[in-house]
Interface confidence: low
């Protein structure tokens, strides 16, 4: 009783809610609920009955596996889904799936809050701006990740001439997606293009893709 599985998916995707074990043999009835009491679909006597709910037309039940297919999930579909099976013995068995639907993160914009010469070095303060989202931040200097303690929306650092990074990337991510924003500087302490506040990867002519999928995979497993 009360098996709970967590699932996180991206909004707009098609989702399969299913259990990892076989259904009880020759069960009498199978019902999927949205929250605790709102029925979505019920299988009984070899046919499925779909109830009036916001899922009507978007769900399909596979009675053999018990899987519930939901198309084009939205954030409003966040909930705990319950599958109840009535066995031939009259006992009920229940499985729960907590579904979290997240929107893909938007592309961040990097703002240069402060850039100044200091003790022959370069003091830099950057902020990574995205519209009101709950995300994780990772900063990279020329592909190398800054320490995890700096994973917030503001990066401040003092660059020495010998370890000067040219391009700074803010990667914003949630469980389902990630996007990068990049800004580049010229030594000793100036924007790469003085007339532009922000230089994106596109502005670099596509020559320099700062972070590859492989790099990201490697960095996340440090």
């Amino acid at each position: 009783q009360g098996h709970l599985v967590h699932m996180t998916v991206v909004s707009g995707s098609n989702v399969t809610l299913n259990i990892s074990e076989s259904l009880p043999e020759n069960y009498k009835q199978l019902t999927w609920f949205y929250t605790f009491d709102q029925k979505i679909v019920e299988w009984d006597s070899r046919k499925s009955k779909y109830f009036e709910s916001k899922f009507k037309g978007r769900v399909r039940l596979d009675p053999q596996s018990g899987a519930l297919y939901i198309s084009k999930v939205q954030k409003e579909d966040n909930s705990t889904y319950i599958m109840r099976v009535l066995k031939k013995t009259g006992n009920e068995q229940e499985w729960k799936i907590k579904l979290q639907v997240l929107d893909p993160v938007p592309k961040p914009v990097i703002k240069i809050e402060k850039i100044e010469d200091m003790d022959d070095n370069c003091y830099l303060k950057l902020s990574c701006v995205i519209p009101g989202e709950s995300v994780n931040y990772t900063w990279y200097g020329d592909k190398r990740p800054f320490p995890k303690e700096l994973q917030n929306s503001v990066l401040e650092t003092t660059l020495m001439p010998h370890n000067y990074s040219r391009c700074y990337t803010c990667q914003v991510s949630n469980s389902v997606s990630s996007k990068n924003g990049t800004v580049c500087l010229s030594p000793p302490c100036t924007l790469a293009r003085s007339e532009q506040k922000l230089i994106s990867e596109e502005d670099l002519g596509g020559e320099q893709k700062l972070i590859s999928e492989e790099d990201l995979h490697h960095h996340h497993h440090h």
């Epitope: 003091y123 320490p147 401040e156 003092t158 440090h222």
Partner: antibody
Framework: EVQLLESGGGLVHPGGSLRLSCAAS????????MSWVRQAPGKGLEWVSL????????YYADSVKGRFTIFRDNSKNTLYLQMISLRAEDSAVYYC???????????WGQGTLVTVSS | EIVLTQSPGTLSLSPGERVTLSCRAS???????LAWYQQKPGQAPRLLIY???SRATGIPDRFSGSGSGTDFTLTISRLEPEDFAVYYC?????????FGQGTKVEIK
């Protein structure tokens, strides 16, 4: 010339508290991340804590999390480490160090000895 | 976290000899972000090498660093009396920054 001078160490009973200070000179203090690194008697170096230049970001080693607090007063060019609930295993020489671009430590102060004993 | 293992633990040598100290990482240190420090008794550590092979300001050229990935080396081409000390490696390619346990170079 960059100089870092620690103070505030001493003998304290288990469960007690201490506040270490590190006075900095010779550089624009508020522009640089700073760190505390400790060394138990006869042992190696262990990174303890980090604070960004403005003081907005702090980070701690798991061994001191919840017990130590790093903070700074940029107007006084001083770095601090507030230590509470001290344990015998916190006994060490505590060094403050300037963090070079969040990479390595250069330079270091001369250290201050903390002894936790009953 | 990345664990750094230094070997040998202690080296007994005479002035004028060549020294090779090893630092091995439990996983690859990205872009050779490795530093070496020297510590003499009663003193604070001093930065010798950063970026695996770049000498810090004021460090004599008898000190050199090399290596990449998981294997790094600090070489002292000709030991001077003031070089007898403990040497530590430190990686800064990933968080948290970690140190090796140290190698002591003592007079034979």
């Amino acid at each position: 010339e960059v100089q870092l001078l620690e103070s505030g160490g001493g003998l304290v009973h288990p469960g007690g508290s201490l506040r270490l200070s590190c006075a900095a000179s010779g550089f624009t203090f508020g522009g640089y991340a700073m760190s505390w690194v400790r060394q138990a008697p006869g042992k190696g170096l262990e990174w303890v804590s980090l604070i960004s230049g403005s003081g907005g970001s702090t980070y701690y080693a798991d061994s001191v999390k919840g017990r130590f607090t790093i903070f700074r007063d940029n107007s006084k060019n001083t770095l601090y480490l507030q230590m509470i609930s001290l344990r015998a295993e916190d006994s060490a020489v505590y060094y403050c160090a300037k963090y070079s671009n969040y990479d390595y430590f250069d330079p270091w102060g001369q250290g201050t000895l903390v002894t936790v004993s009953s | 976290e990345i664990v750094l293992t230094q070997s040998p633990g202690t080296l007994s040598l005479s002035p004028g000899e060549r020294v090779t100290l090893s630092c091995r990482a439990s996983q690859s240190v990205s872009s050779s972000y490795l530093a070496w420090y020297q510590q003499k008794p009663g003193q604070a550590p001093r930065l010798l090498i950063y970026g695996a092979s770049s000498r810090a300001t004021g460090i004599p050229d008898r000190f050199s660093g090399s290596g990449s990935g998981t294997d790094f080396t600090l070489t002292i081409s000709r030991l001077e009396p003031e070089d007898f000390a403990v040497y530590y490696c430190q990686q800064y390619g990933s968080s948290p920054r970690t140190f090796g346990q140290g190698t002591k170079v003592e007079i034979k």
